[in-house]
Interface confidence: low
């Protein structure tokens, strides 16, 4: 459990892959902190408790309630708010101390699930990574998020300040492109319930300590039960789901959200002056201006909201979680003031929820979303966000109920459909998930054009034998989610040579291949000895990648880390491999034995990243009946020979022999990655 430098932790993506051939690896889900352009950083996930987390989808637009809310309704909102506010100081958000004097930050071990402070969200952004890694993941632009508010505020300025001397310009603040916390989508395919994940958790790089999810551990468990993980980007709740749509935008504009109460209208000039500073990027000055307004007018909701926004901007500018926690608290304060206009209340709480998610305070965010839904029960978009909030903490059952409720009221809500389909697929209700995923994507609603949904729709269709799967993969490719129809990994570095099968010479790793082929019997014998004496070390594939059969693996290295316990079972093999850093240092891969028994079929699936190539050394290969297809070419293994393929391309495996098949899997860095990229890419 060494404490982990968040930096290290961030950016570790979980894997969702397991290649059909004997491996089914899934590195625990890691929350990823994704940078927009190169989502390379991801937050850490705790181990023990961890539950793969994926992220929220896009968030909803801020739809303001009717502008003139009657006083009565206002009072109701106020009283409900007050009840809730005080009842709830949300859990984890202000973990002031979490970073502070709590002793050693708990690193959550994959296993331990201790709480730990995974909050270094800003600081961990690994700015040095220069390569472009596009993780086709959930990318929601965070930018929308604050700017959702922005839109509304601007309207405010337009509408309530017609004579404002300057035209209100869309905020040009830098948004956390990088801050979208893109969490990985863990697809444990059909295993999501508080089940025991049968997986191989090879603890790895970034999970927090013992029992807590997300906080500071360095270990990440490779959970073998997670099938494709697509990285999800944490979408800021407020990230305007519907506002991408011009029509919606217009509608929202028409609504002219009301951000000023009667009192605030009387101090409008002062508010505008402070807001102007913020909009011009003079953040420190704006903070001071709003602080002064809050001091002078402690009951002013708009002044308090302005202060929160300035703190939010400042957090982004300084990349400071501590400042962001202050903003989260201030957004909360807005909601606890008397006579808060409904639109402002909604904006403030939505942004609060979003920033809580960004910091990894999923439970706190959920409480905020629950509160929003109570306050604005007719706002479907908030219910959709609430569903995402539940998904983010692993509560599929409640998420499912939320989406069922949304669909009962608005049956054509595309966002609810894709998420409901997603949940059904997670429950292994493959056929039932298809119409929801399909119609949801077809709806074109904001938040539905996400690689994960194409990924799962295609996968579901393949599993029920529907040839239309490739139509959806093609569409996903056209829309920029996949590198090609065949190559559907989500964590990719652009520009790397892409071909399904490789020769040793093409990889440049000829010495490694020679060494594997020269020593294949030694490698085989150690694997067989483990099978014989410690069969329990071979852990079953549990990513729901198999249509049928029996398939297990025994992992020696994962995420660039040697598993000392495992190497005790195969000491010579481990010693042999130590000479080859292209594999032992491949933090986006594994080294493992893979045993597959007769009668096994592994569904077509795709690995998580194009940053590795996968070598298969045949150890015990039945005469016939075993084959692997990668893209559109099918091959068979031979004892003592290495096959090399790029598992970011779709691959499928069949074992129809009469005895077991044992191979040794060795992942290597893609040969075109530079040394700097190899050092800086987050682990998978």
């Amino acid at each position: 459990f060494d404490l982990v430098d968040y930096e290290e932790v961030l950016g570790k993506l979980g894997i969702y892959d397991a290649d059909g051939d004997g491996d089914f690896d899934v590195d625990d889900a890691k929350v990823l902190l994704g940078l927009k352009e190169r989502s390379t950083s991801e937050p850490a996930v705790p181990p023990e408790e961890a539950e793969p987390h994926t992220e929220p989808e896009e968030q909803v637009p801020v739809e303001a309630e009717p502008q003139n809310i009657e006083d009565e309704a206002k009072e109701q909102i106020q009283s409900l708010l007050h009840e809730m506010v005080h009842a709830e100081h949300v859990e984890g958000e202000d973990l002031q101390q979490e970073d502070g004097p709590t002793g050693e930050p708990q690193q959550e071990d994959d296993e331990f699930l201790m709480a730990t402070d995974v909050d270094d969200r800003f600081e961990t952004l690994e700015p040095e990574v220069s390569h472009e890694e596009t993780e086709h993941s959930y990318h929601v632009e965070e930018t929308v998020s604050q700017d959702c508010n922005q839109d509304m505020e601007e309207m405010m300025s337009e509408q309530e300040n017609p004579d404002s001397s300057e035209p209100v310009v869309e905020d040009e603040r830098l948004h956390h492109d990088t801050d979208d916390v893109t969490y990985q989508v863990y697809e444990e395919q059909a295993v999501y319930e508080p089940l025991e994940n049968e997986g191989i958790e090879i603890t790895e790089v970034t999970a927090p300590p013992e029992d807590n999810p997300v906080e500071d551990s360095q270990v990440i468990v490779e959970e073998v039960s997670i099938f494709p993980v697509e990285e999800q980007q944490e979408v800021p709740p407020e990230t305007n789901r519907k506002t991408d749509d011009p029509e919606q935008k217009a509608k929202v504009k028409k609504k002219k959200p009301k951000l000023l109460n009667k009192f605030d209208k009387t101090i409008k000039a002062e508010l505008d002056a402070a807001e102007k500073l913020r909009k011009r990027g003079k953040i420190e000055e704006a903070v001071n201006a709003f602080k002064e307004l809050v001091r002078k007018y402690p009951q002013s909701p708009r002044a308090r909201y302005g202060k929160a926004q300035c703190e939010d901007d400042l957090a982004e500018k300084r990349r400071s979680n501590e400042v962001l926690r202050g903003a989260i608290e201030t957004y909360q304060e807005v909601a606890s003031l008397p006579d808060v206009p409904a639109d402002l209340l909604k904006l403030s709480l939505k942004r609060r929820s979003d920033r809580q998610q960004f910091l990894g305070h999923m439970r706190g965010s959920l409480l905020t979303l629950q509160r929003l839904v109570q306050l604005f029960p007719n706002d479907t978009s908030l219910k959709n966000d609430l569903g995402v909030g539940y998904l983010l903490i692993g509560d599929n059952d409640n998420a499912k109920k939320v989406y069922e409720e949304v669909l009962s009221v608005t049956p054509n809500d595309g966002f609810a459909k894709v998420h409901y389909g997603f949940i059904l697929k997670a429950q292994n209700k493959i056929a039932e998930s298809i119409p929801y995923l399909k119609e949801g994507i077809e709806s074109g609603d904001p938040g539905t054009d996400d690689g994960r949904f194409y990924f799962h729709l295609g996968d579901a269709m393949q599993r029920v034998g529907n040839k239309e799967a490739y139509k959806w993969y093609e569409l996903g490719h056209k829309r920029g989610h996949f590198a090609s129809v065949w190559q559907r990994s989500l964590y990719n570095v652009n520009g790397l040579k892409a071909q399904p099968w490789w020769t040793p010479k093409e990889t440049g790793y000829t010495e490694l291949v020679k060494s594997l082929e020269r020593n294949w019997k030694l490698i085989r014998d150690e694997g067989l000895a483990v099978m014989d004496k410690a069969k329990g070390l071979f852990l079953p594939e549990d990513e729901n990648l198999r249509e049928k059969g029996d398939w297990s693996q025994f992992t020696l290295w994962q995420q660039g880390r040697r598993n000392e316990n495992a190497c005790k079972g195969a000491p010579k093999t481990c010693t042999l491999l130590e000479k080859f850093p292209e594999t032992t240092g491949c933090r986006r891969g594994q080294i493992k034995y893979s045993i597959m028994h007769p009668g096994t079929h592994v569904w077509p699936h795709t690995g998580p990243t194009n940053c590795r190539l996968r070598m298969h050394l045949g150890l015990v290969i039945p005469k016939e009946g075993c084959k692997i297809r990668c893209a559109n070419e099918t091959k068979t293994w031979e004892e003592g020979k290495v096959l090399i393929f790029d598992d970011s391309f779709e691959h499928e495996v069949w074992q129809d022999a009469s005895s077991f098949r044992l191979i040794f899997i060795v992942d290597v860095w893609h040969p075109e990655l530079t040394p700097q990229q190899r050092r800086s890419l987050p682990a998978i």
């Epitope: 181990p47 408790e49 979490e98 994959d110 699930l113 201790m114 807590n212 439970r363 995402v388 000392e564």
Partner: antibody, heavy 127, light 107 residues
């Protein structure tokens, strides 16, 4: 069904060692971190140690650090607590407990508390 | 390490009453706090984790709230089977620790 069964404890003299084991069944043992928790007669619960799902990491309470070792054998679905240099204050009922966890792609690994406990085994340290 | 305190040590209430327990921590543990119930001669069982999340099998009458350093779980209406000892436990920092317990007995 999901079950944890501790081995018989026993009476042991101060300074002597004792090894407890906990046999797991009904779930995928290798996917869960495991704890030992103890309870002195008439007292409250005291956390003792935890080991990660794969046995590679462990943590201990200050009162037992350096004397107790937690380990596991996933091939046998068994958790162990090796107790050396036992003291009278180590007397009590020892429970093994599983860390509950779940996963779904939308969420990180999540924690569900120590959700399954053994029935407990009594250790008495006395001369 | 973090020290947990629970009050009262004993709470005597009749069935059907509402029971409110309290757990304080010497440092901020955020929401990383669980509650366990233990009956005489039995192993503990988890009731709630991460403050307010009911574990599988925990009746809806049990609820949890609080964050940071002060936590107050409640049982809305005591049933005969609820008379037991209740422990809070933090997992925010090592070493993990339990509180001393609150005994809820029948008045």
């Amino acid at each position: 069904q999901v079950q944890l069964v501790e081995s018989e404890g026993g009476v042991v003299q101060p300074g002597r060692p004792l090894r407890l084991s906990c046999a797991a069944s009904g779930f995928t043992f290798s996917s869960h971190a495991m704890h030992w928790v103890r309870q002195a007669p008439g007292k409250g619960l005291e956390w003792v140690a935890v080991v990660s799902h794969d046995g590679s990491r462990d943590r201990y309470a200050g009162s037992v650090k350096g004397r107790f070792t937690i380990s596991r054998d996933n091939s046998k679905n068994t958790l162990y607590l090796q107790m050396n240099s036992l003291r009278p204050e180590d007397t009590g009922v020892y429970y093994c407990a599983r860390v509950g966890r779940s996963s779904n792609w939308f969420s990180r690994y999540y924690y569900y508390g120590m959700d399954v406990w053994g029935q407990g085994t009594t250790v008495t340290v006395s001369s | 390490g973090i020290v947990l305190t629970q009050s009262p040590a004993t709470l005597s209430l009749p069935p059907r009453e509402r029971a409110t327990l309290s757990c304080g921590t010497s440092q901020n543990v955020s929401h990383y706090l669980a509650w366990y119930q233990q009956k005489p001669g039995r192993a503990p069982r988890v009731l709630t984790y991460d403050v307010a999340n009911r574990a599988a099998g925990t009746p809806a009458r049990f609820s949890g709230s609080g964050s940071g350093t002060d936590f107050t779980p409640a049982i809305s209406s005591l049933e005969p089977e609820d008379f037991a000892v209740y422990y809070c436990q933090q997992r925010s920092n090592w070493p993990q620790a339990f509180g001393p317990g609150t005994k809820v007995d029948i008045k």
